[in-house]
Interface confidence: low
């Protein structure tokens, strides 16, 4: 007869490992007992369990509660055992020794490999600001055994670098994603992808990019200067900009205080019926935590009385 086993048994941390040992004998042969031991190189054998054909399973104190026989029905020639809740310390060489009648003793070895799935963590880098050079956007670290693979999934253009730290029974892999920040990256996902033989599927952690910026400011409302004449109602100036974080707006008048009746409503400056006192230089000041911008315009309120041609035009238009 001969023993059937596996060269390597691979199990994920916390799962049960089946250590196979089956005696394929001639008819009439019987298995008296099967002894399981751990036999790592350089260390003495450590007994796990003894399967006796008459007395059943005896588990050594060091493995009490952790070694069982597979559930019934059982073949009397099957000396396989289950090692419950495998931990990484269980990784190593195991030997089954089978005593048969009348053929004698047989032994076989297998290696137990315990996979430790990683638990990845993603750490965002420093605040991203438009105008910076190559900057760390995020780093992703995963520790496991064997070493996990850490990659990035994103539409954003950038560069990656990885490093690995070997611990006594695991390896930690850190990958960094660097980019040159631009406003177009705002809201874009940056996903760390961790692969490992102990995972049923890749683990993914997504970080949403936030890039601080402030666009140039401009003022709308003066496109047709002829509309800015005495008596006009509903005249307004609107300040245009965009930024991250969203900017706040402030209006001032360069050549004096804002005229009475002028309303400031965020990015909009609303005028009462126009008079010549509304002429002047108006400044829109845009700011966020990242930067500030100014845009100024000159308002020149026309007096139709001073230009008969214009007055005629206005009359004919009415």
């Amino acid at each position: 007869g001969e023993l059937e086993t596996s060269d390597v048994v691979t199990v994920v941390l916390g799962q049960d490992a089946k250590l196979p040992c089956f005696y394929r004998g001639d008819s009439g042969e019987q298995v008296g007992q099967v002894a399981w031991a751990r036999v790592d190189a350089g260390e003495g054998a450590q007994e796990l369990a003894l399967l006796h054909s008459k007395y059943g399973l005896h588990v050594s104190p060091a493995y009490e509660g952790r070694v069982e026989q597979p559930p019934p029905p059982r073949n009397p020639l099957d000396g396989s055992v289950l090692l419950r809740n495998a931990v990484q310390a269980d990784e190593g060489e195991y030997e089954c020794r089978v005593s048969t009648f009348p053929a004698g003793s047989f032994q076989a070895r297998l290696r137990l490999r315990v996979l430790v799935p990683p638990l990845p963590s993603l750490n965002p880098g420093p605040a991203l600001e438009e105008g910076q050079g190559l900057t760390l956007a995020a780093s992703c670290t995963a520790e496991g055994s064997p070493a996990p693979s850490v990659t990035w999934d994103t539409e954003v253009k950038g560069t990656t670098s990885s490093r690995s730290f070997k611990h006594s029974r695991s390896a930690a892999v850190t990958s960094e994603f660097h980019l040159v920040p631009s406003r177009s990256m705002n809201g874009q996902p940056l996903t760390c992808v961790v692969s490992h033989p102990g995972l049923l599927q890749d683990q993914r952690i997504t970080h949403i990019l936030h890039v601080s910026f402030l666009a140039e400011a401009s003022v709308r409302g003066l496109e047709d200067q002829n509309l800015w004449h005495i008596g006009r109602e509903g005249a307004m100036l609107k300040c245009l900009s965009e930024g991250q974080p969203p900017p706040s707006y402030n209006w001032t008048r360069l050549d004096g205080p804002l005229p009475s009746g002028v309303r400031v409503d965020g990015d909009t400056l609303g005028f009462p019926p126009l008079t010549t006192e509304h002429s002047g230089i108006y400044v829109c000041h845009v700011s966020n935590e990242f930067s500030s911008r100014d845009s100024q315009v000159t308002v020149d309120v026309l007096d139709p009385q001073e230009d008969s041609g214009k007055q005629v035009d206005l009359v004919s238009a009415s």
Epitope: L13, N85, V87, A89, V116, L119, E143, S168, R169
Partner: antibody
Framework: EVQLVESGGGLVQPGGSLRLSCAAS????????MSWVRQAPGKGLEWVSR????????DYADSVKGRFTISRDNSKNTLYLQMNSLRAEDTAVYYC???????????????WGQGTLVTVSS | DIQMTQSPSSLSASVGDRVTITCRAS??????LAWYQQKPGKAPKLLIY???SLQSGVPSRFSGSGSGTDFTLTISSLQPEDFATYYC?????????FGQGTKVEIK
């Protein structure tokens, strides 16, 4: 019997330095990773640092990184913690602890010293 | 870092009571959890490792359970010497982190 005995604590001014020692006996010091854990007065436990058997890898809590250095001398069965640029918030009882490596790649702490008090005050 | 949250932060109980302390991890930590007991002025003592394994020499009235994010320490029949502070600790990732502690006091 496993024994861990810390020494080197005391009163030090902010910005000062101290070196803690932990003498191990009763087991094979070279086969276990070691940690320092601290406990501020009336507060909970905070892990500080770890060193592996052959000193190849050291880990630190963010709160002490760049200021504290863990080391070991396997020939003397001794663990050390060099503490520089000490702050008032470093005031605590500092324990050395043995890590139970034979269980998994993560480590619990199966033996602890009695602790040594470090007080940072002007 | 993984946050460990214990509840309750303190409890009052009588000798013979069954006491349960819970510990929740901010993310899954498999069974990489230990429980420690600390008495005033003393060093912590390991009670339970791997979430449910009893450390050698610890009385069998202490037991642990749970996996993933939710864990429990149970004292089946509280004894006078069990009045102490209990801490959970994850050691799945670096840095290892402790719960804030649960103080068990005499009612």
């Amino acid at each position: 019997e496993v024994q861990l005995v810390e020494s080197g604590g005391g009163l030090v001014q902010p910005g000062g330095s101290l070196r803690l020692s932990c003498a191990a006996s009763g087991y094979n010091f070279t086969t276990s990773a070691m940690s320092w854990v601290r406990q501020a007065p009336g507060k909970g436990l905070e892990w500080v640092s770890r060193i592996y058997q052959d000193s190849s890898t050291t880990d630190y809590a963010d709160s002490v990184k760049g200021r504290f250095t863990i080391s070991r001398d396997n020939s003397k069965n001794t663990l050390y913690l060099q503490m520089n640029s000490l702050r008032a918030e470093d005031t605590a009882v500092y324990y050395c602890a043995r890590q139970t490596e034979d269980r998994s790649y993560g480590y619990d702490l199966d033996y602890w010293g009695q602790g040594t008090l470090v007080t940072v005050s002007s | 870092d993984i946050q460990m949250t214990q509840s309750p932060s303190s409890l009052s109980a009588s000798v013979g009571d069954r006491v349960t302390i819970t510990c929740r991890a901010s993310q899954g930590i498999s069974s990489y959890l230990a429980w420690y007991q600390q008495k005033p002025g003393k060093a912590p003592k390991l009670l339970i490792y791997a979430a449910s394994s009893l450390q050698s020499g610890v009385p069998s009235r202490f037991s642990g359970s749970g996996s993933g994010t939710d864990f429990t320490l149970t004292i089946s029949s509280l004894q006078p010497e069990d009045f102490a502070t209990y801490y959970c600790q994850q050691h799945y990732t670096t840095p290892p982190t402790f719960g804030q502690g649960t103080k068990v006091e005499i009612k």
